[in-house]
């Protein structure tokens, strides 16, 4: 005997003596029986019988929201007038991906509009899109469970050379954007100071062109260009970079006075204001937040404050006059 065994007996509520099958049949003209809620939904004002003209409200379980008209009305013939209503998931569940792939940010649930980035170990790239966005109850584009990492052709080609270069005999020469970049490489968001425009470029093409001394090309972020804070900061960072005394190569990027190159990710990471060293003659006169007082800050402090998205108005380069 198992208490979990199901022999098809109808349920009995703890406080009721009768099985549901023993309840008297309801006459149609005396109202409506309880309607069937949509999947992942329930009836808020639940009862056995509803009067003609009475409304029931459909609610959704946590993590779901109602889409459509969420009220049913009891009609004189004992049926319900109900529009199309469904409970749609408001969050996406963390996708199941192959172990070699890293999900950033790593959470159990993601809200609509939130994005994830899939990355691979050094020397490998995602064999497909790397950025996915939660839309309703699914990821866009859909995440294939066979998605994996593949050897980065850039790494293979470059040998002992720097990114954007390839080995030619015993020396390193720049890759040709046309000839050497026909293979798949991850998308980067890039800014061109000449055209004052940003666009999505394959990593191989960007690095090859940068190697060929196209100094007007600036890396903004990994992944295709999408409006948002990351792009906004990328553009502001490019403007500030012209005055930076430090220009340290770091993966696809170049790190400036207010940044540190992360050894483990090969990405430039903003320092926090207290990590700025006082030295440097690149000074700015600024106004912080809603303050009316002026303050002299160095380029590192300005960069870290703007990177942290704190409100600051640059009044002019150089020390404050007062």
């Amino acid at each position: 005997f198992s208490i979990m065994e199901n022999n098809g007996q109808p349920c009995i509520n703890d406080d009721e003596e009768m099985k549901e099958v023993d309840l008297p049949e309801i006459e149609a003209d005396s109202g409506c029986p309880q309607p069937v809620p949509p999947e992942n939904g329930f009836i808020r004002n639940e009862k056995q019988l509803y009067l003609v003209g009475e409304d029931v409200e459909i609610s959704c379980l946590t993590g779901f929201e109602t889409v459509g008209y969420q009220y049913f009305r009891c009609l004189p013939d004992g049926t319900w007038r109900q529009g199309d209503v469904e409970c749609q998931r408001t969050e996406c569940i963390k996708p199941v991906v192959q172990e070699v792939l890293t999900i950033t940010p790593f959470q159990r649930l993601y809200r609509i509009g939130e994005s994830i980035e899939l990355t691979c170990p050094k020397g490998f790239v995602v064999a497909g899109p790397s950025r996915y966005t939660c839309q309703g109850n699914s990821w866009t584009p859909p995440i294939s469970n066979s998605l994996t990492c593949e050897k980065d052709t850039l790494t293979k080609l470059k040998g002992h050379c720097q990114l954007g270069q390839k080995q030619s005999g015993s020396e390193c020469i720049c890759m040709s954007p046309e000839e050497d970049c026909s293979h798949h490489s991850e998308d980067l968001c890039v800014f061109d100071t000449d055209s004052n425009d940003y666009f999505t470029s394959p990593a191989c093409k960007f690095l090859a062109e940068k190697c060929l001394n196209n100094q007007q090309l600036h890396f903004l972020h990994i992944g295709s260009c999408q409006d948002g804070r990351q792009l906004e900061w990328g553009l502001e960072r490019t403007r500030l970079s012209s005055n930076s005394t430090k220009k340290e190569s770091c993966g696809y990027d170049t790190c400036y006075d207010w940044e540190k190159c992360s050894a483990s990710t090969s990405k430039c990471v903003c320092l926090l204001p207290p990590q700025c060293f006082k030295g440097g003659n690149q000074l700015y006169c600024v106004k912080m937040g809603s303050s009316t007082s002026e303050k002299t800050l160095n380029i590192c402090e300005v960069g870290t404050i703007r990177c942290a998205n704190r409100k600051m108005e640059i009044l002019h380069p150089g020390k404050c006059l007062a």
């Epitope: 926090l272 990590q275 006082k278």
Partner: antibody, heavy 118, light 112 residues
């Protein structure tokens, strides 16, 4: 070699005051922000306050605002923490800390014990 | 304030064994430009804390490479590939992505 040596700790009654000092050496003191971090008995670590290069900007944790004052004297290579209206929950070992490009608290002193009790 | 929950609270290990400490944040530490300010410290008995890992996975200066950090968003891990006697102490995670900076309650590592 970076060295930070705290002093000024001791036993004080609730409502009382105490001034902690931190003597810095082995680096150009005026070129760095500085901070105080504390550790209550058998408790974890807690950031207390931070000061910029010349003392023109200070930052405090909410529970000490209005009671504690962080200051510095660059000529003496010294950092201070003036603690007024002390409470029992301020009992802790107080550490002086300096940042680096790696972290906000990269270098620490050995700490000085402050006990607030009647 | 951001709460950092460390597990386990105590670890008793045999030298040479691997160890893993978890740090879970009450909110995501990934900021809107893609940076995560998560650090790991070790406080050896009778000493002040020392930096082990910064920015989730970068090794602090002079830290042996048996230490490694990983994670993103709200879940972070410190791993020691082979525990040595000198690794005994309390391990703390710390975040600086949101003000005020906060520390985890600590994980005590002792030898069997």
């Amino acid at each position: 070699e970076v060295q930070l040596v705290e002093s000024g700790g001791g036993l004080v009654q609730p409502g009382g005051s105490l001034k902690l000092s931190c003597a810095a050496s082995g680096f150009t003191f005026r070129d760095y922000y500085m901070a105080w971090v504390r550790q209550g008995p058998g408790k974890g670590l807690e950031w207390v306050a931070t000061i910029n290069y010349d003392g023109s900007s200070t930052y405090y944790r909410e529970s000490v605002k209005g009671r504690f004052t962080i200051s510095r004297d660059n000529a003496k290579n010294s950092l201070y923490l003036q603690m007024d209206s002390l409470r029992a929950e301020d009992t802790a070992v107080y550490y002086c800390a300096r940042p680096s490009t790696e972290a906000l608290f990269a270098y620490w002193g050995h700490g000085t014990l402050v006990t607030v009790s009647s | 304030d951001v709460v950092l929950t460390q597990t386990p609270l105590t670890l008793s290990v045999t030298p040479g064994q691997p160890v893993s400490i978890s740090c879970r944040s009450s909110q995501s530490l990934l900021n809107d430009v893609g940076n995560t300010y998560l650090y790991w410290y070790l406080q050896k008995p009778g000493q002040s804390p020392q930096l082990l890992i910064y920015l989730v996975s970068d090794l602090g200066s002079g830290v042996p490479n048996r230490f490694s950090g990983s994670g993103s968003g709200t879940d972070f891990t410190l791993k020691i590939s082979r525990v040595e006697a000198e690794d005994v102490g309390v391990y703390y995670c710390m975040q600086a992505s949101h003000a005020p900076y906060t520390f985890g309650a600590g994980t005590r590592l002792e030898l069997k």
